[in-house]
């Protein structure tokens, strides 16, 4: 069977006026996954995002991440889009320096 990922969005200060938002998916199986940032509902181009490899996390499941740099104050226009085993979920950027875990249920 399939195991849905845990998805976690964090933010960190980049250069002045910019922040890096990172979306991590973990504990999922099988390894096929789509993880991408969307702006105003539409996927960002590949060249504006950085992806990590899909790696085993030691429990027979996998993990990966995607990050992009955005202007501070524009965070609410962005969502991390996750697609796995025919299911999808969207994950906004938290306010301030907090972070939040979302569990996507199949």
């Amino acid at each position: 069977g399939s195991v849905p990922p845990m998805v976690n969005v964090t933010r960190s200060e980049a250069s002045e006026g910019n922040i890096t938002v990172t979306c991590r998916a973990s504990s999922f199986y099988p390894r096929n996954i789509t993880l991408t940032w969307r702006q105003d509902g539409v996927s960002l181009s590949h060249d504006t995002q950085q992806w990590g490899d899909v790696l085993p996390d030691g429990n027979g499941t996998y993990q990966t991440w995607v990050a992009t740099r955005i202007c501070q104050g524009e965070e609410q226009r962005f969502t991390c889009y996750m697609e796995h085993s025919g299911n999808h979920s969207t994950h906004p950027v938290p306010s301030g320096n907090s972070h939040h875990h979302h569990h996507h249920h199949h």
Partner: antibody
Framework: EVQLVQSGAEVKKPGASVKVSCKAS????????IEWVRQAPGQGLEWIGA????????NYNEKFKDRATLTADKSTNTAYLELSSLRSEDTAVYFC??????????WGQGTLVTVSS | DIQMTQSPSSLSASVGDRVTITCRAS??????LAWYQQKPGKSPKLLVY???TLADGVPSRFSGSGSGTDYTLTISSLQPEDFATYFC?????????FGQGTKVEIK
């Protein structure tokens, strides 16, 4: 102009199924998620689920995941909601809406589904 | 699931009145809140998103504010066309949930 045009009213018997359509125009259909919401008579709004028309991937409210099926036809720019095992409590207006990042910017006109024996 | 508690459920007001509607979330929704206006037999119309951003074409008498769990929609000077039902909706996490609505009636 972005438009979502839904199919007409339906009357169904308990236990039957209904399929509501939502035809999109004025934008790139496969680029945006389509959401489904319902509103029982005189009641509030309830989110049913969403579909990515580009890939067919879905996200269901747990309450509906056993009875609702969301599909999309890219060739006709049309999204569909099928609800099975209908009961009287499913009598409601069903809406589709476009997900623009983190809100719904455009809604269909609604489709009234009446479940009555 | 995040519960959205909207108040009041209804109110009576006169043209020109200032009207305030509140929405409280059962958890922090990080300002991912929208307000909609709905008239009988019509679909909801987006008024405000991201808690305080006015949607295109919405008159400036409408404003939204709030953060964390508490949010407010204000109509600074009620106009005849504003008599309707207003809903809030959170977009922080699925299932997306709505307030039960506030019906604004003519006094």
């Amino acid at each position: 102009e972005v438009q979502l045009v839904q199919s007409g009213a339906e009357v169904k018997k308990p236990g039957a199924s209904v399929k509501v359509s939502c035809k999109a125009s004025g934008y790139a259909f496969t680029n945006y998620l389509i959401e489904w919401v319902r509103q029982a008579p005189g009641q509030g709004l309830e989110w049913i689920g969403a579909i990515n028309p580009g890939s067919g991937a879905t996200n269901y409210n747990e309450k509906f995941k056993d009875r609702a099926t969301l599909t999309a036809d890219k060739s006709t720019n049309t999204a569909y909601l099928e609800l099975s095992s209908l009961r009287s409590e499913d009598t409601a207006v069903y809406f589709c809406a476009r997900f623009l990042g983190n809100y719904f910017d455009n809604w269909g006109q609604g489709t009234l589904v009446t479940v009555s024996s | 699931d995040i519960q959205m508690t909207q108040s009041p459920s209804s109110l009576s007001a006169s043209v020109g009145d200032r009207v305030t509607i509140t929405c409280r979330a059962s958890g922090n929704i990080h300002s991912y809140l929208a307000w909609y206006q709905q008239k009988p037999g019509k679909s909801p119309k987006l008024l405000v998103y991201y808690a305080e951003t006015l949607a295109d074409g919405v008159p400036s008498r409408f404003s939204g504010s709030g953060s964390g769990t508490d949010y407010t929609l204000t109509i600074s000077s009620l106009q005849p066309e504003d008599f309707a039902t207003y809903f809030c909706q959170q977009f922080w996490t699925t299932p997306y949930t709505f307030g039960q609505g506030t019906k604004v009636e003519i006094k």
